[in-house]
């Protein structure tokens, strides 16, 4: 699995996506959770509605929160007010059984600032960017807002 | 075993420049968040700067940010610090540190022997 | 910036006695905190880690307290090898940021 680098600002949310194909994972719950080291577990954080079918609905665990488009296929991970303690490897998972596929591997880092970004000096806005290895950056921030553009909505 | 050792440090006339690295070995050095500690003489401990894992996020001390610049080679299990326009209070022995938490930060538990920077005319 | 202000500055005890070192937050800090030991020549030694966690390594004797703002080191029987100078440092909120330091030297 690539590993997709999500990036956010401490003290403000970050959401974190994750596709699959909905048709394959019809009718399992997903959840999200946190490695703590290169062997050890996966550690669950949070997971959708016991029933399936009201994936959608909001689950929270602390500041933590999912909800699953079943039909088109996103898992969604709000971090709300990160914190620097948030950043680490972290897996979206496709549940079955006592099993569990890995959707994708998510790098979260937390930055102390907007301008503590490796390119301090462009603008930059959610989106791909720069490789680790094998994976790639998502942006989950922006850096300063040209005139006539249009903010991005407020997270509480 | 699990090692830092620095490197680079020297004297230097204000205004002038100097590259530290610091060579890690005895774990995946691209599983951690890497970072520089200096100690002026007779004084604390103080952050310079750190590095994610994948280099891409970063974090300097005011003190230093503008004139520092911080990066990791994964491939060389390396880690470095540019200073530029150095001055006296940037005299210390800065020391390389291994960030505690997989993929993520937390207390340095593991530190190299540290490198010497003197900024004197 | 979150302060940390660490006490006593210095702390003359003999082997054997008990020692009992303070860091107070400016603000809270959870459990977010570490504490290291220096000696004179040597880097820093991570004793302890989310306030109450010894460190691969670390004897027993050194146990770490506290939550929020008021977190206390305990070393319960100090040896020779302890004499040291102590730091704190939190890592709750950018800037993370050391205490002064205490110095625990022998009376």
């Known amino acids: 699995h690539n590993t997709t680098v999500f990036q956010g600002v401490a003290g403000q949310s970050l959401q974190v996506s994750c596709p699959y194909d909905s048709m394959k994972h019809w009718g399992r719950r997903k959840a999200w959770c946190r490695q703590l080291g290169e062997k050890g577990p996966c550690q669950r954080v949070v997971s959708t509605h016991n029933l399936w079918l009201l994936s959608f609905l909001r689950r929270w665990n602390g500041s933590t929160a999912i909800t699953d488009d079943t039909l088109g296929g996103t898992l969604t991970i709000t971090l709300r007010n990160l914190q620097p303690h948030d950043a680490g490897l972290y897996q979206c998972q496709s549940l079955h059984g006592s099993e569990a596929d890995t959707l994708r591997k998510v790098l979260v880092e937390v930055l102390a600032d907007p301008l503590d970004h490796r390119d301090a000096g462009d603008l930059w806005f959610p989106g791909e960017s720069e490789s680790f290895e094998d994976a790639h950056v998502e942006h989950s921030i922006s850096r300063s807002l040209l005139e006539g553009e249009i903010p991005f909505p407020p997270t509480s | 075993q699990v090692q830092l050792v620095e490197s680079g440090g020297g004297l230097v006339k204000p205004g002038g420049s100097l590259r530290l690295s610091c060579a890690a070995s005895g774990f995946t050095f691209s599983d951690y968040y890497m970072s520089w500690i200096r100690q002026a003489p007779g004084k604390g401990l103080e952050w310079v700067s750190y590095?994610?894992?994948?280099?891409?996020?970063?974090y300097y001390a005011d003190s230093v940010k503008g004139r520092f610049t911080i990066s990791r080679d994964n491939a060389k299990n390396s880690l470095y610090l540019q200073m530029n326009s150095l001055r006296a209070e940037d005299t210390a022995v800065y020391y390389c540190a291994r960030l505690g938490g997989y993929y993520s930060l937390g207390p340095m538990d593991v530190w190299g022997q540290g490198t010497t920077v003197t900024v004197s005319s | 910036e979150i302060v940390l202000t660490q006490s006593p500055a210095t702390l003359s005890l003999s082997p054997g006695e008990r020692a009992t070192l303070s860091c107070r937050a400016s603000?809270?800090?959870?459990?977010?905190l570490a504490w290291y030991q220096q000696k004179p020549g040597q880097a820093p030694r991570l004793l302890i880690y989310?306030?109450?966690n010894r460190a691969t390594g670390i004897p027993a004797r050194f146990s770490g307290s506290g939550s929020g703002t008021d977190f206390t080191l305990t070393i319960s029987s100090l040896e020779p090898e302890d004499f040291a100078v102590y730091y704190c440092q939190q890592d709750s909120a950018f800037p993370f940021t050391f205490g002064g330091g205490t110095k625990v030297e022998i009376k």
């Open positions: 603000q809270s800090v959870s459990s977010y």
């Open positions: 590095i994610s894992s994948s280099g891409s996020t970063i």
């Open positions: 989310d306030a109450s």
